[in-house]
C-alpha cells in the first residue's frame, strides 16, 4: 500500500485521524517539507527578541534582537548585550579595553594592538581603546639619507611663497 503521506505538501501534515488526508498546519505551526506527520510549533520572538520574519504555514519565524543587543548562535538563538567601541563584555557587564588592546565593534573582545616592529615597521598613529595602531615605514626608511621610491618634494625656504 502506497504511503499517501508522501503526497502531502509543505504547509500541511498527514492526518492519521482522518485516513491520511493532508490537513493544513494549525495556526502557530508550520511544516517546511512535504510528507510530515505533524507540524512544528512556531518559535516565539518575545522580550529581547523581535520578529524578523513572521511564521508561515511553510516556514518558522525568524528572530532578531532588539536595539542594544546582537544575535549569537545559529538562527539567532541568543541575544547578547552590545557594548560601546573600546569595550568588551565580561560577566560583570561592559568593561573598557585594557591599555594595549582595542575593540572597534559593539561586540566581541578587546584585541592587542598590532606590534609594528614584528613587521620591521614603526608606529605611525598610536592605538586607542577603539582603534588599532597604524604602522608606517620602517625606522630605517625614515632615517636621513635613506633611499625612497619617490623623490622628496623640494623644500621651501621659510618666508617664501611658491612662484
Amino acid at each position: 500500500l502506497q504511503d499517501l503521506c508522501s503526497n502531502c505538501p509543505a504547509g500541511t501534515f498527514c492526518d492519521n485521524n482522518r485516513s491520511q488526508i493532508c490537513s493544513p498546519c494549525p495556526p502557530n505551526s508550520f511544516s517546511s517539507a512535504g510528507g510530515q506527520r505533524t507540524c512544528d510549533i512556531c518559535r516565539q520572538c518575545k522580550g529581547v527578541f523581535k520578529t524578523r520574519k513572521e511564521c508561515s504555514s511553510t516556514s518558522n519565524a525568524e528572530c532578531d534582537c532588539i536595539s542594544g543587543y546582537h544575535c549569537l548562535g545559529a538562527e539567532c538563538s541568543m541575544c547578547e548585550q552590545d557594548c560601546k567601541q573600546g569595550q568588551e563584555l565580561t560577566k560583570k557587564g561592559c568593561k573598557d579595553c585594557c591599555f594595549g588592546t582595542f575593540n572597534d565593534q559593539k561586540r566581541g573582545i578587546c584585541r592587542p594592538w598590532t606590534n609594528c616592529s614584528l613587521d620591521g615597521k614603526s608606529v605611525l598613529v598610536n592605538g586607542t581603546k577603539e582603534r588599532d595602531v597604524v604602522c608606517g615605514p620602517s625606522p630605517a626608511d625614515l632615517s636621513p639619507g635613506a633611499s625612497s621610491a619617490t623623490p622628496p618634494a623640494p623644500a621651501r625656504e621659510p618666508g617664501h611663497s611658491p612662484q
Epitope: Q44, K46, V48, C63, S77, Q81, G93
Partner: antibody, heavy 121, light 111 residues
Framework: QVQLQESGPGLVKPSETLSLTCTVS????????WTWIRQPPGKGLELVGY???????SYNPSLKSRVTISIDTSKNQFSLQLNSVTAADTAVYFC???????????????WGQGTTVTVSS | QSVLTQPPSASGTPGQRVTISCSGS????????VNWYRQLPGTAPKLLIY???QRPSGVPDRFSGSKSGTSASLAISGLQSEDEADYYC???????????FGGGTKLTVLG
C-alpha cells in the same frame, strides 16, 4: 532535568525590602528568561518580572518602581528585590523558566516549588 | 483584577466533559499562543497545555485546548476525581511585554 529552588526570608516588615534568590540546577542559566511570579493567598498568578542571561529585564508595570531582578550566571542564580513592601505583597513567590528566551515555544515550563513571604510587623 | 478572564468555578461528575473558558484581548490571546496550567493545593502550577493545543509529554489526551480570536478554552473529558484543582490560562501580552494570567478556575468533581 532543570530544577529551581527559591530561598530567602519568610517574614519581612512593612516598608522594608523583600529579597529572594532562585538557584538553577541541572542546566545552564545562559539562555531562557528567568521569571518571578507571585500568588497572593487565595488569589491568582501575577508576573512580577523576568531577566535574560545577558541582563535584559522586563517588569510588571504595577510593580516597576519597586522591583529589581538581577542575575549571576557564574553562580547559576537570579534574584528578586522588592522595595517598600506592604501587606499586599504577602504571597507565595515562584521562580520559573520561560523558554521564549531560548529559541522555544513552551513558555513558562519549569517552576520552583514556591516560597511564602509574609509582610507583617 | 486579572488581565485574562476565567470563570471562578466549574464542576462536573466523574466521566463527564467540562470546559473552562478564558477571554483576553488582541494584545494577548488574539495575537499569541495560550498556555494552560493546573495547580494542586500547596504546589506550583504545572504546564498542562502549551501553544493553544499541545500537550507536554505525560499529560493524558483527556486534556485538550483550543483558541478562537481573543478567547481560548480548556476541555477535560472523562472527568476524574484527581482532576479537582485550580486551572489557569496564560498568554504573552505584547503591550505589557510579559506573561499575563487568568484569575483561575476552581474545578470541583462532584459525587
Amino acid at each position: 532535568q532543570v530544577q529551581l529552588q527559591e530561598s530567602g526570608p519568610g517574614l519581612v516588615k512593612p516598608s522594608e525590602t523583600l529579597s529572594l534568590t532562585c538557584t538553577v540546577s541541572g542546566g545552564s542559566i545562559s539562555s531562557y528568561y528567568w521569571t518571578w511570579i507571585r500568588q497572593p493567598p487565595g488569589k491568582g498568578l501575577e508576573l512580577v518580572g523576568y531577566i535574560y542571561y545577558s541582563g535584559y529585564t522586563s517588569y510588571n508595570p504595577s510593580l516597576k518602581s519597586r522591583v529589581t531582578i538581577s542575575i549571576d550566571t557564574s553562580k547559576n542564580q537570579f534574584s528578586l528585590q522588592l522595595n517598600s513592601v506592604t501587606a499586599a505583597d504577602t504571597a507565595v513567590y515562584f521562580c520559573a523558566r520561560d523558554d521564549y528566551g531560548g529559541n522555544g515555544y513552551y513558555g513558562v515550563d519549569v517552576w520552583g516549588q514556591g516560597t511564602t513571604v509574609t509582610v507583617s510587623s | 483584577q486579572s488581565v485574562l478572564t476565567q470563570p471562578p468555578s466549574a464542576s462536573g461528575t466523574p466521566g463527564q466533559r467540562v470546559t473552562i473558558s478564558c477571554s483576553g484581548s488582541s494584545s494577548n490571546i488574539g495575537n499569541n499562543p495560550v498556555n494552560w496550567y493546573r495547580q494542586l493545593p500547596g504546589t506550583a502550577p504545572k504546564l498542562l497545555i502549551y501553544s493553544n493545543n499541545q500537550r507536554p509529554s505525560g499529560v493524558p489526551d483527556r486534556f485538550s485546548g483550543s483558541k478562537s480570536g481573543t478567547s481560548a478554552s480548556l476541555a477535560i473529558s472523562g472527568l476524574q476525581s484527581e482532576d479537582e484543582a485550580d486551572y489557569y490560562c496564560a498568554a504573552w501580552d505584547d503591550s505589557l511585554n510579559g506573561w499575563v494570567f487568568g484569575g483561575g478556575t476552581k474545578l470541583t468533581v462532584l459525587g
